[in-house]
């Protein structure tokens, strides 16, 4: 953007510039060009030698300018177009300026002026051009600065040329007010900060409802000496609840939302949310639907799952396998886990209590992702109820629970009751019993025995009957003996570990360690 401080051509001759010496040298003239009057200051004292004719502008108020640009349009006659070549003829003139805080009026002093440059034409107007009225217009531009006083004068010194000054335009440059990346940059005077830093850094301000992104850089632009904006740095983003429309941030329409400052547009409210109002930063969940803390606001609201489907409990001796299928309604989530709880009831009293401490699960019973688990170490003649609960990421936000239960009675064989029937120095005869009602379920009995104090080796005997004789034993030695029933479902409960002692070789019943 150019701000004009002085425009001779535009003033249509109304500028009364000072000439020195007065009445000699420079003269204001009017010509007709394209049926329009044009004004010019001209001088053409080429024959007389030693010319020193000055033309001074009126005082020009500097405004905010630090550097001014001076654009001159002029013609210069070819010295050879004059008779004899006019030995004192020149084809250049000099440009001066002087700064001041006040208008000196007609008080003109050459010594106050500083030379800017010698102005030479690119093209000179020769005789034939002049006669054909085909004058060669030259355009020259010079820069002056930095200026510090309130105003200034320009002066043109003729030293014997034939010059016509058609236009003098003085202006300074500004980088215009600008909107870029949702930031407003103010109109800025084009100045070089220094010779090594020819750009001025200008901070922008975010437009309404735009913000600098968290951790990001604020908007900056560089204003060049030529009044051009360069190299944008940083940006503004429309804040939550607003989206970019051209160079502004507009509130999200009803039914849309935007949860953070970003370049993205407003998003439509997801499933199972209530319609949002204008400028919404989120959409509230419908009643009965929820958002887990880690759920993005763009995700549909979800609800806890229904209970697991088809829970079955398959008893296997002292074990039970629980199997179930996923809930029919997942609540719209994939993060379903299951937890199993156990309750045992004593059939004789009907009293019930938790049994987590006394049973063993094949894997930890909380946060299961699989749909089966095996529970072992169940007690015989006990009723068990297992509850399988389905949970997802929003189950913790409600008090209700979604579970299915299955009950099972354990009829595992009772541990055999073992006793020592007979013994010798090298053998032990052991017998056992179980309730008659359970005998048909037993396939075989397994007798495990080892020397007391020898934990590293043991012997196993299997039998279908209710007794066994363990022989090839050491005299006067204690043996640890255990009997376990084997059923079609697997191992029944084991008996106690009994301590039985062989006779000593002296025939006495001395005990051994």
């Amino acid at each position: 953007k150019e701000v004009v401080l002085l425009d001779f051509a535009a003033m249509k001759g109304e500028l009364g510039w000072l000439t020195h010496p007065y009445g000699k040298g420079w003269d204001l003239m009017q010509n007709i060009m394209d049926d329009m009057p044009i004004y010019m200051y001209s001088v053409c004292n080429v024959v007389s030698g030693d010319q020193d004719n000055w033309l001074r502008t009126n005082w020009v108020y500097r405004e905010e300018a630090e550097r001014i640009f001076i654009e001159l349009k002029f013609t210069v006659r070819d010295c050879n177009s004059f008779p004899g070549g006019a030995s004192s003829c020149k084809e250049t003139f000099n440009l001066y300026y002087a700064e001041s805080d006040v208008d000196y009026g007609t008080n003109f002093q050459k010594r106050q002026f500083t030379k800017i440059d010698t102005i030479a034409p690119d093209e000179i107007t020769v005789s034939s051009d002049f006669e054909a009225r085909n004058v060669k217009l030259n355009v020259e531009e010079r820069m002056v600065g930095p200026l510090t006083r309130k105003g200034f004068y320009l002066a043109f010194q003729d030293i014997g040329a034939c010059v016509a000054l058609l236009s003098v335009r003085v202006y300074y440059k500004k980088c215009p007010e600008m909107l870029q990346s949702l930031a407003r940059f103010p109109e800025t005077i084009a100045v070089a900060v220094s010779d090594t830093q020819p750009l001025a850094t200008v901070a922008g301000t975010c437009v309404d409802h735009a913000v600098v992104p968290y951790g990001g850089e604020g908007p900056l632009m560089h204003c060049t000496v030529d009044g051009e904006w360069l190299v944008p740095i940083g940006q503004c983003l429309c804040q939550e609840g607003y989206e970019k429309v051209e160079d502004a941030c507009r509130a999200c329409s009803p039914g849309f939302f935007k949860s953070e400052a970003s370049e993205s547009p407003c998003l439509e409210c997801p499933e199972h949310t209530l319609p949002s109002t204008e400028g919404a930063t989120s959409c509230q969940c419908e009643e009965g639907y929820f958002r887990a803390p880690e759920d993005p606001l763009s995700m549909s609201c979800t609800r806890p799952p229904s209970a697991p489907n088809y829970l079955t409990a398959i008893g296997m001796g002292a074990k039970v396998e629980l199997r179930w299928t996923a809930p029919k309604d997942t609540g719209g989530r994939q993060d379903i886990v299951y937890s199993v709880t156990c309750e045992q009831c004593w059939p004789e009293s009907g009293e019930c209590g938790p049994c987590e401490a006394s049973v063993r699960y094949s894997e930890p019973p909380h946060a299961l992702t699989r749909t089966s688990v095996t529970v072992s170490d169940l007690e015989p003649h006990m009723n068990y109820t297992f509850a399988v609960e389905a949970r997802n990421g929003v189950s913790g936000l409600v008090t209700s629970r979604s579970f299915r239960t299955a009950s099972v009675s354990i009829n595992q064989t009772e541990p055999p009751k073992v006793r020592l029937e007979d013994r010798s120095t090298t053998s032990l005869s052991v017998t056992w019993s179980i309730p008659v009602s359970q005998q048909s379920r037993v396939w075989k009995y397994e007798v495990t025995y080892r020397k007391k104090g020898d934990a590293n080796s043991y012997n196993v005997r299997r039998t279908e009957g209710f007794s066994v004789t363990l022989d090839d034993l050491a005299p006067d030695t204690t043996y640890l003996v255990q009997v376990q029933a084997l059923t079609q479902e697997g191992q029944g409960a084991g008996s106690k570990v009994h301590e039985f002692q062989t006779l000593s070789t002296e025939g006495s019943a001395n005990m051994a360690v």
Epitope: R419, G494, H498
Partner: antibody, heavy 130, light 109 residues
């Protein structure tokens, strides 16, 4: 009916040796494994070890956590058994009990290791303090 | 070494049934004994061999043992039953005697 009477020093300094004796009145001394048990203030019971004297041999069995410092011996002529615990510290402050098992160790080839204790001594409070 | 786990405390109203558990790996294969200890007194045997009572112990004390849990049941609890209760087993693998950590029974009201 068997009775147990115990005695010994009640106040010790760190690094000294704790010494307690338990006398058995009534019953067959050599048929049983005799035990020492202790209970620190406000805490649970801890088995120290056991001894049985048969013929001329002592059969000992100690808690692994105390084994390096403990000795349980027998004086069969007096029907007494004793506990010695060396290098005591404040952590050994406790009530110390002697105890008799419910049944003889072995009867007709059936043995009862770690049997229930049906008779206990009156307890001796031993304090270790500097 | 073999470990017996008891709940630190159990509370029950008078006249109700108290159940004190003692957990241990395959404890069902071992004989479990139970003691009652009142403040300042030596322990008293109340149940031996899982479920047998010594003479003089009332029948309101009973026991069971299966799998990994032994249970002492005190029916019709009264204020005089308030005490610490300990379970005990013999670990035949190491030939050492082991006590549980004890359970404080509180009779409410």
């Amino acid at each position: 009916q068997v009775q147990l009477q115990q005695w010994g020093a009640g106040l010790l300094k760190p690094s000294e040796t704790l010494s307690l004796t338990c006398a058995v009145y009534g019953g067959s001394f050599s048929d049983y494994y005799w035990s020492w048990i202790r209970q620190p203030p406000g805490k649970g019971l801890e088995w120290i070890g056991e001894v049985n004297h048969r013929g001329s041999i002592n059969y000992n069995n100690y808690n692994p956590s105390l084994k390096s410092r403990v000795t349980i011996s027998v004086d069969p002529s007096k029907n007494q058994f004793s506990l010695k615990l060396t290098s005591v510290t404040a952590a050994d402050t406790a009530v110390y009990y002697c105890a008799k098992p419910l049944r003889p160790h072995c009867t007709n080839g059936v043995c009862y290791s770690g049997d229930a204790f049906d008779i206990w001594g009156q307890g001796t409070m031993v304090t270790v303090a500097s | 070494s073999y470990v017996l786990t008891q709940p630190p405390s159990v509370s029950v109203a008078p006249g109700q049934t108290a159940r004190i558990t003692c957990g241990g790996n395959n404890i069902g294969s071992k004989n479990v004994h139970w003691y009652q200890q009142k403040p300042g007194q030596a322990p008293v045997l109340v149940v031996y061999d899982d479920s047998d009572r010594p003479s003089g112990i009332p029948e309101q004390f009973s026991g069971s043992n299966s799998g990994n849990t032994a249970t002492l049941t005190i029916s019709r609890v009264e204020a005089g039953d308030e005490a610490d209760y300990y379970c005990q087993v013999w670990d035949s693998s190491s030939d050492h005697l082991v006590f549980g950590g004890g359970t404080k029974l509180t009779v409410l009201g």
